[in-house]
Structures are given as structure tokens and as C-alpha cells.
């Protein structure tokens, strides 16, 4: 049903859903801090623009009695329950920030008349693609897929002269929310990734993965998995690995690889890590000081959600336009705004664009080094290290199929 919005006469409210089930196990207090820091910045920016208005956030807490798993598995109804709570209280703001779980976002989008914008720190799954009033501030699965297909096809770099068309995907069901949906997208038979590959098999058991590492009859040399180095070590340990195996470790929200004193463990030598380019000022910022690298990105997305709302509010107010309109609800896309840590770009569908970074372990220095970067906004690769000190033969990535001749 239509809910009146607290969104006019110089007073603009943001509804922040504080759900018990979340993409990342982050104390809600930290998210509140991030939102409040964002509000301070927005107020300052609006004041500097000569706009004398009030911007506040209302935090809507779930009762947590029914939906208490803490992860996203029971989030489907929690989001709707919170919306019902908002509806009953007649306390809808100009914009809804949260939820972060794909299940809840999808259901909320499906079951409500969204005449207001929804901003999500998460909602990684393909089912949340192309939603007209949904904005996602953490890289969704679609962006990962486009990178992987682009990289698989590449055969014109001195370190990658073979196009790939095959892959194993390791997915055992214990993944974090982001990894779950990233791997889900790769597994889906109708996805772009599956469409572009000639062979793809999902490995669901630890033993399956371990066996492939030395199996002479394997159908692909490439294995995609998602998680951190420790996750890989638990699975792989110090087992021998065939020399032409390449493991692609998707670990987007982890900037530990860029820290000065980090040395890559030996088990990472056959691994390319896909992560996001780290922010400049985040490490010392007040809201992120006590957060782990992953949670920093999650809290940052909440903060940037507030800044995005401030950006749009400023534009509409300066143009004398109404905020409680479909035009406003559909405006949170195809733009760049000033985020907490520099410019943030949203694509035509309201999904954040970013610079993905592919790292390798230098056999000389045992450090993580940047191999290439990939701009998701223009789907373009930027080579960085043209002569990487790889573990693989001739400092080139191997063919994806053992024994196949030169291409």
C-alpha cells in the first residue's frame, strides 16, 4: 500500500533498515556510526550549497524474534516485516537504505510498490539486476562475470596468450553472502559466464577440489573459488599442485593484499587473486578504524548510500524539483557522486562501478603484485606488469586445457 513519505517542507528523512540478517556480520552500532558520519557530511554539503534543510535518518530495527539466523538465509520475510512496520507507523523516508541480502531485496522489490529509491549495501545476486529503483553500492555478481569472461577471452597480452573456454568452480555451500551469489552466478546455466564457456563443472566437495589439483585427466586447468587465502589453505593445505593449474581466488572486499608488510604464503603461488582497488583514506577514517577490511567496505557502502542521497537531494532541490516523485526514485543511476573516499560511479542500472585488480604472487619477492586492473564501467583491461615473475612456465599463464597446442 502507498505510505506517506516524510520528505518535504525542508525536512528529509532516510529510512535505514537495521536487519538482524545481514550480508556481513557487522554490529548494527557500526552501521549506525557510518550512517551518522554520512549525515554530517551531507548536512555540510547542503549548507555549503546554500540549502537550508534538515536531513535525518530513522533506524528501523527488526524485532529479531523470528528471523534470527544472523545470515541471509532467513532474510526473505524480515525485509517485508520491516516494511510492514514502517507502513503501520507511517514513517517512510524519502529513501530506503538496506537491505543487504539478495533474498530480502528481491522479495521487497517484488512485493511492494516502489515509488521511492532503495539503496543496498549488498544484494549481490543476478536476481537483483536491472531493478529500476534499486541502487547497489557493492560490486554485484554481474560485474564479476563480465570481468571473468573478458579475462578468459584475452589472448593478446605477453603473459596471457591463450584464450580460455573452460573452468571448474568450487562451491561447497559454506560461503559468505557475497561469495554465495558470485559463485551462484557462475554456476547458473543461463548466465553470461556459462553461455561463453565451453566447459564448466561445479566442484562441491573438498575432495573433488583436492583431486583435481593433480588429476591428469582434468578437463580444465582453471579453478575459480571465492574467499580469502586462509580459506584456500584450509582446502588445499600444502598439497602438490600440477604446474599448469591456475586458481582464481575471488576476494573482492579485502584490501590486506595491499598492506606493505604482507608476504604471500607459498600456497598462493599458483593463485591469481581478484580484489578491488583499495581506497586511499579509509584506513585512518574514524568510522572504519575498528573494522576488518571486509566490514570496512560494508560500512562504507552504508556511508556512501547516505552521500548518494545527499547528492540527489541537492540536485533536485537546486532544480526546484519534487522529491516524492517517480522521477526521483528512478534517478539514482548513470551518475558519479563524491563518495567518502573519492568519486563513486553508478552504471545505467544503479550498480556501483569499480576498478577490479588481479594480483599474482611474485616468485622473486613473495609479494602480491598487480598484474592488471579492470574498469567495470567501460569493461576495459589495463595491463600493469608486462613481465610478471610468475610460477608458471615462460612467465605466461598456461592454456586452460592441458596438451592443447599454441593459439
Amino acid at each position: 500500500s502507498q505510505v506517506s513519505q516524510n520528505c518535504h517542507n525542508g525536512s528529509y528523512e532516510i529510512s535505514v533498515l537495521m536487519m538482524g540478517n545481514s550480508a556481513f556480520a557487522e554490529p548494527l552500532k557500526n552501521l549506525e556510526d557510518a550512517v551518522n558520519e554520512g549525515l554530517e557530511i551531507v548536512r555540510g554539503r547542503l549548507q555549503n550549497a546554500g540549502l537550508n534543510v534538515t536531513v535525518n535518518a530513522t533506524f528501523m530495527y527488526s524485532d529479531g524474534l523470528i528471523h534470527n539466523s544472523g545470515d541471509c538465509r532467513s532474510s526473505t520475510c524480515e525485509g517485508l516485516d520491516l516494511l510492514r512496520k514502517i507502513s503501520n507507523a507511517q514513517r517512510m523516508g524519502c529513501v530506503l537504505i538496506g537491505p543487504s541480502c539478495t533474498y530480502s531485496t528481491f522479495q521487497m522489490y517484488l512485493d511492494t510498490e516502489l515509488s521511492y529509491p532503495m539503496i543496498s549495501a549488498g544484494s549481490f545476486g543476478l536476481s537483483c539486476d536491472y531493478k529500476e529503483t534499486l541502487t547497489r553500492l557493492m560490486s554485484p555478481a554481474r560485474k564479476l562475470m563480465y570481468f571473468l569472461v573478458n579475462f578468459w577471452k584475452t589472448n593478446d597480452l605477453p603473459f596471457k596468450t591463450y584464450s580460455w573456454s573452460t573452468s571448474y568452480v568450487y562451491k561447497n555451500g559454506t560461503e559468505t553472502e557475497d561469495c554465495f551469489w558470485y559463485l551462484n552466478a557462475l554456476e547458473a546455466s543461463v548466465s553470461y559466464f556459462s553461455h561463453e564457456l565451453g566447459f564448466k563443472v561445479v566442484l562441491r566437495q573438498d575432495k573433488e577440489f583436492q583431486d583435481i589439483l593433480m588429476d591428469h585427466n582434468r578437463k580444465s586447468n582453471v579453478i575459480i573459488m571465492c574467499g580469502g587465502p586462509e580459506f584456500l589453505y584450509k582446502l588445499k593445505g600444502d598439497r602438490a599442485v600440477a604446474e599448469d593449474i591456475v586458481i582464481i581466488l575471488v576476494d573482492l572486499f579485502n584490501d590486506q593484499y595491499f598492506e606493505d608488510n604482507v608476504t604471500a604464503p607459498d600456497y598462493m603461488k599458483n593463485v591469481l587473486v581478484l580484489t578491488l582497488s583499495p581506497g586511499n583514506s579509509l584506513l585512518n577514517s574514524s568510522f572504519s578504524r575498528n573494522l576488518s577490511p571486509t566490514k570496512r567496505d560494508f560500512a562504507l557502502a552504508y556511508l556512501n548510500g547516505i552521500l548518494l542521497f545527499g547528492h540527489m537531494l541537492k540536485i533536485f532541490l537546486e532544480n526546484g524539483e519534487n522529491i516524492t516523485t517517480p522521477k526521483f526514485a528512478h534517478a539514482f543511476r548513470n551518475l558519479t557522486f563524491e563518495g567518502y573516499d573519492g568519486p563513486v560511479t553508478l552504471d545505467d542500472w544503479g550498480d556501483v562501478d569499480s576498478t577490479m585488480v588481479l594480483l599474482y604472487t611474485s616468485v622473486d619477492t613473495k609479494k602480491y603484485k598487480v598484474l592488471l586492473t579492470y574498469d567495470t564501467h567501460v569493461n576495459k583491461t589495463y595491463p600493469v606488469d608486462m613481465s610478471p615473475t610468475f610460477t608458471w612456465k615462460n612467465s605466461k599463464l598456461p592454456n586452460d586445457i592441458t596438451g592443447r597446442g599454441p593459439q
Epitope: D156, Y382, V384, M386
Partner: antibody, heavy 118, light 106 residues
């Protein structure tokens, strides 16, 4: 418009060093690798090395590893190449060239002539 | 390092002629790149990834080939095409250039 403007011609004595600059404009300097290429009189083009201005990664052609040192100043959008222990065979035109993968070396500087003569 | 051998080294032709320049690699490469250089000027990117014309290059130019043999073809030579053409590979590190083919007016 993309432009790479190199420093002027240099005449040096054997044993000396020279530092050639290449100022980039018309694009984001840190987005693209910068290559250096040598063209000695009557010789083919020779690739010397490449630098990624964003991460500072540098790859040298083994042949020039002890001859050339590539650096950059990102705030000035400028790449540099220093040649040490100059000898007569270092007499050449030196070019900087932007890498715009997949179109390698898509823009070139105008070249800097280095003459080594006693 | 991969050696690139261009032939011919010199080529005399008249405007309107069809001209073909060959580049042979000492081992197989996936793609070839071509540059044009005029006297007193720096090289210009001309053809990349074997057959893609760089920005501003006339459509009378074309590139083809695979493996170790690549060609640059000018379908109808124009006065402004008289220059030296270099092939280049980046399949293996380091990138290497051919010795050049000088196209002169007959």
C-alpha cells in the same frame, strides 16, 4: 587531445648521464603504461622498457637493464628515462609511447635526440 | 626474443598501385601490430591486433595473417602513404620490431 611532449635534444660526453622527460596531457596519466623506445641511426626500433604510473611497476628489456632507469612524477604527469655511462652507441632518438591496450603504443612523443660525442 | 623479418626492405611503387608488405616472425604469435613513420617524425600506430585500423587510418589499408606470417596491404597507394612501415609483436616479452619497409615513389 592526447599529447606526449618530450624534452629537447641533448649533447653529452661519453661517461655522462642524461635524463629525458615526457609530459603527458589530454588523458589521465596514471591510467596507461608508458613505454620507451630507442631508434638509433639506420637501426630498427628497440623497445627499452615500460612503466605503470599508478603502481610504479617497471619492466625493462634485459638489454637496457643497466643502461636505463625509468621513473615518473604523477603530480606532474611526467615520465622520465635516465641513461647512464653514455657511449657513442647510445646516440639515438628516444621516444616515449603510451600503451592503450589493446592498441599498444597508440601515441608517441616527438622524440628526443641524444648525441654522445667527445 | 622473437625476431621479426620484414620484406621487402625497400619498395618502389606508383600512386594507385596495390602494395603488400610481409612480416615473418621467428616463432608463432597471435597478433601483429604495424606503425607508419615519415622522415623527421615519430612513428604512428597504424594497425593493431593484426587487422584493426588505428584512429584516422584510411580504409585502403588492411592487415591480415596468422602464426608466423603477417601482411600489411595498401589497396591503392596514395602520395601520403610514402613512408616506412614497421611491424611489431607483443606475444612474447620483450616486444620487438621488424627492420622496416620503406615505400618510395617510383
Amino acid at each position: 587531445e592526447v599529447q606526449l611532449v618530450q624534452s629537447g635534444a641533448e649533447v653529452k660526453k661519453p661517461g655522462a648521464s642524461v635524463k629525458v622527460s615526457c609530459k603527458a596531457s589530454g588523458y589521465t596519466f596514471t591510467d596507461h603504461n608508458m613505454n620507451w623506445v630507442k631508434q638509433a641511426p639506420g637501426q630498427r626500433l628497440e623497445w627499452m622498457g615500460v612503466m605503470n604510473p599508478k603502481f610504479g611497476t617497471i619492466n625493462y628489456n634485459q638489454k637496457f637493464k643497466d643502461k636505463a632507469t625509468i621513473t615518473r612524477d604523477t603530480s606532474a604527469s611526467t615520465a622520465y628515462m635516465e641513461l647512464s655511462s653514455l657511449r657513442s652507441e647510445d646516440t639515438a632518438v628516444y621516444y616515449c609511447a603510451r600503451d592503450n591496450y589493446p592498441n599498444y603504443f597508440d601515441y608517441w612523443g616527438q622524440g628526443t635526440t641524444v648525441t654522445v660525442s667527445s | 626474443d622473437i625476431q621479426l623479418t620484414q620484406s621487402p626492405s625497400f619498395l618502389s611503387a606508383s600512386p594507385g598501385d596495390r602494395v603488400t608488405i610481409t612480416c615473418s616472425a621467428s616463432s608463432s604469435v597471435n597478433y601483429m601490430y604495424w606503425y607508419q613513420q615519415k622522415p623527421g617524425s615519430s612513428p604512428k600506430s597504424w594497425i593493431y591486433r593484426t587487422q584493426n585500423l588505428a584512429s584516422g587510418v584510411p580504409s585502403r589499408f588492411s592487415g591480415s595473417g596468422s602464426g608466423t606470417e603477417y601482411t600489411l596491404t595498401i589497396s591503392s597507394l596514395q602520395p601520403e602513404d610514402f613512408a616506412t612501415y614497421y611491424c611489431q609483436q607483443y606475444h612474447d616479452y620483450p616486444p620487438t620490431f621488424g627492420g622496416g619497409t620503406k615505400v618510395e615513389i617510383k
